[in-house]
Amino acid sequence: AAIGSCSKEYRVLLGQLQKQTDLMQDTSRLLDPYIRIQGLDVPKLREHCRERPGAFPSEETLRGLGRRGFLQTLNATLGCVLHRLADLEQRLPKAQDLERSGLNIEDLEKLQMARPNILGLRNNIYCMAQLLDNSDTAEPTKAGRGASQPPTPTPASDAFQRKLEGCRFLHGYHRFMHSVGRVFSKWGESPNRSRR
């Protein structure tokens, strides 16, 4: 739940959600630093860093949901992302090890900032859900597969496979956030009307 008063203005809140998803779909915030830290920044390895189909809801799936269903799915998916991020963070090298390997501390900081960034977005999603619940016309909730458990780590044979799994997951996350941004951009001017 959000702390502090949520904005009561639909257009303001929608604008805030669009700004946040716009910033978060960007691979420089998560995927690229992860690739550099894990030593996967090689063209041949990057080819293997492609999302597993079905790991995240597709844009088509997201577009097919009602607004409430979309927010529920988004919230649940981001919940799973937070769990997986915690798992990835535990496996990252420590700051002093990075320095010794001549890698950029800033990459580690970017990865650490991902969690609060997602928490912030989720709080605004909560605010928008509240606002829609209080708006005049109810719309049937058509929830998606929800979390679809995006990232259950496959039993990896070794550390390298785990790194690739993390890479694929983050690739999928950014693609998902891009889709989320596109869906938000199609939302109408008022909470009572959809332009879908």
């Epitope: 702390i3 008063s5 691979t27 420089s28 900032m113 609060p116 928490l119 912030g120």
Partner: antibody
Amino acid sequence: EVQLVQSGAEVKKPGESLKISCKGSGYSFTSYWISWVRQMPGKGLEWMGIIYPGDSYTRYSPSFQGQVTISADKSISTAYLQWSSLKASDTAMYYCARVPVSPAYLDYWGQGTLVTVSS
Amino acid sequence: DIVMTQSPDSLAVSLGERATINCKSSQSVLYSSNNKNYLAWYQQKPGQPPKLLIYWASTRESGVPDRFSGSGSGTDFTLTISSLQAEDVAVYYCQQYYSTPLTFGQGTKVEIK
């Protein structure tokens, strides 16, 4: 309406401690980061650091690391900037500003708190 | 740290004329994977806090008059006020958010000639 309201001007002596505040309203305080920015008299803007009030995750500019402490109390939607021992060179206007995602642009600013340090 | 350098330090422009401010970054703030420039512009009027005008180098913040426009890519950026109004007298700052620490240009003071 989004607002960041900062505490009033302060006049302090060198060596004294100080904590200034920035209260957010009109939006969910834990949906954003808060940055602090210094503006010395007649000078430009300097980024000091940033905090996510949801879990108090904090990052400082290397220039300000160890010089100030940034904190937040999400229960009262307030962020803080504090000094344990002020210097005359800390005399400046201090702004808090809201940041949608870190790092990014600063989309709403507080009115500023003028801190004067003089013996 | 990325160093931001603005030019000129100040300029005087007649009402209704065009004002152009330049900003140069010490390294590119263009991210190739999404082709976006991590650059913002702010306006600070005397005795007031800064106000966000433009982000992503060219996207106007909600409520900002369309006489303000941003352009440029990589390391070279421009803020243009197409027809200067009396209320535009202010100091203008560019800021990069490509990496931390966030850094600002030194500011450009715009006055009326």
